[in-house]
């Protein structure tokens, strides 16, 4: 079988590692250097991606398989395979094409990357503020205001008798 | 350029086992990869097992397990060590870095 499929296509025998050298009729011939095919049946080995600048190695080119790049610190990967670093800014903060910025009030960014998004809107879920929110912390939403009222349904225990005219907390 | 020499080859019955050499000279520094190939009357040539440019031993399915690519860089050589031989794998070897090819060395393996 394998002597039959060589001479149909001899590339389709040319293991990961090697290319279809067109120059040498066609027999397998290993990736030259910094070159890798990560797949059989190649007919060019690619040249392997170099980090360079702003992107650093995390996975070293190899004759089967392609170079793997992060970002330096101070920024992070973007796009499939980490095809760009974008700059870090602090949590409370968003990038801009001017640089790092402060979130505006009522919304927040908890990450170094990212865009600063509107603190939960606790009412539209008839829910109460229990925490507010910072430039760094979306708001923490509470019981809705009816089930702190005086009389109102609980599943939870009710509460000791007050004193006349003390509210509950 | 390099210059390559192979020996070794002989007639071996099935089972049994060879080890082919391959010595460099002239511009070694230049090899960074270096392969056995293997190629019978009227067949196209064959790689058998590589030295990849990262160093890696690289081997086809036909000889995985059996064979064995190994490197004296003080010698300037490199070996073949062949294990488990098969009739199949009856063929005219050669060494291989670049251009520069041997004159290749004649494995028979026969009952």
């Known amino acids: 079988f394998e002597r039959t499929r060589s001479l149909q296509d001899p590339c389709s025998n040319c293991p990961a590692g090697t290319f279809c050298d067109n120059n040498r009729n066609q027999i397998c011939s290993p990736c030259p250097p910094n070159s890798f095919s990560s797949a059989g049946g190649q007919r060019t080995c690619d040249i392997c991606r170099q980090c360079k600048g702003v992107f650093r190695t995390r996975k070293e080119c190899s004759s089967t398989s392609n170079a793997e790049c992060d970002c330096t610190p101070g920024f992070h990967c973007l796009g499939a395979g980490c095809s760009m670093c974008e700059q870090d800014c602090k949590q409370g903060q968003e990038l801009t094409k001017k640089g790092c910025k402060d979130c505006c009030f009522g919304t927040f960014n908890d990450q170094k990357r990212g865009i600063c998004r509107p603190w939960t809107n606790c009412s539209l879920d008839g829910k109460s503020v229990l925490v507010n929110g910072t430039k760094e912390r979306d708001v923490v939403c509470g019981p809705s205001p009816a089930d702190l009222s005086p009389g109102a349904s609980s599943v939870t225990p009710p509460a000791p008798a007050r004193e006349p005219g003390h509210s509950p907390q | 350029a390099v210059q390559l020499v192979e020996s070794g080859g002989g007639l071996v019955q099935p089972g049994g086992s060879l080890r082919l050499s391959c010595a460099a000279s002239?511009?070694?520094?230049?090899?960074?990869?270096i392969s056995w190939y293997r190629q019978g009357s009227g067949k196209q040539r064959e790689l058998v097992a590589w030295?990849?440019?990262?160093?890696?031993?690289h081997y086809v399915d036909s000889v995985k397990g059996r064979f064995t690519i190994s490197r004296d860089n003080t010698k300037k050589t490199t070996y073949l060590q062949m294990n488990s031989l098969k009739l199949e794998d009856t063929d005219v070897y050669y060494c291989?870095?670049?251009?520069?090819w041997g004159q290749g060395t004649q494995v028979t393996v026969s009952s």
């Open positions: 002239g511009n070694i520094s230049s090899i960074r990869v």
């Open positions: 291989n870095s670049g251009d520069s």
């Open positions: 030295f990849a440019w990262d160093n890696v031993a």
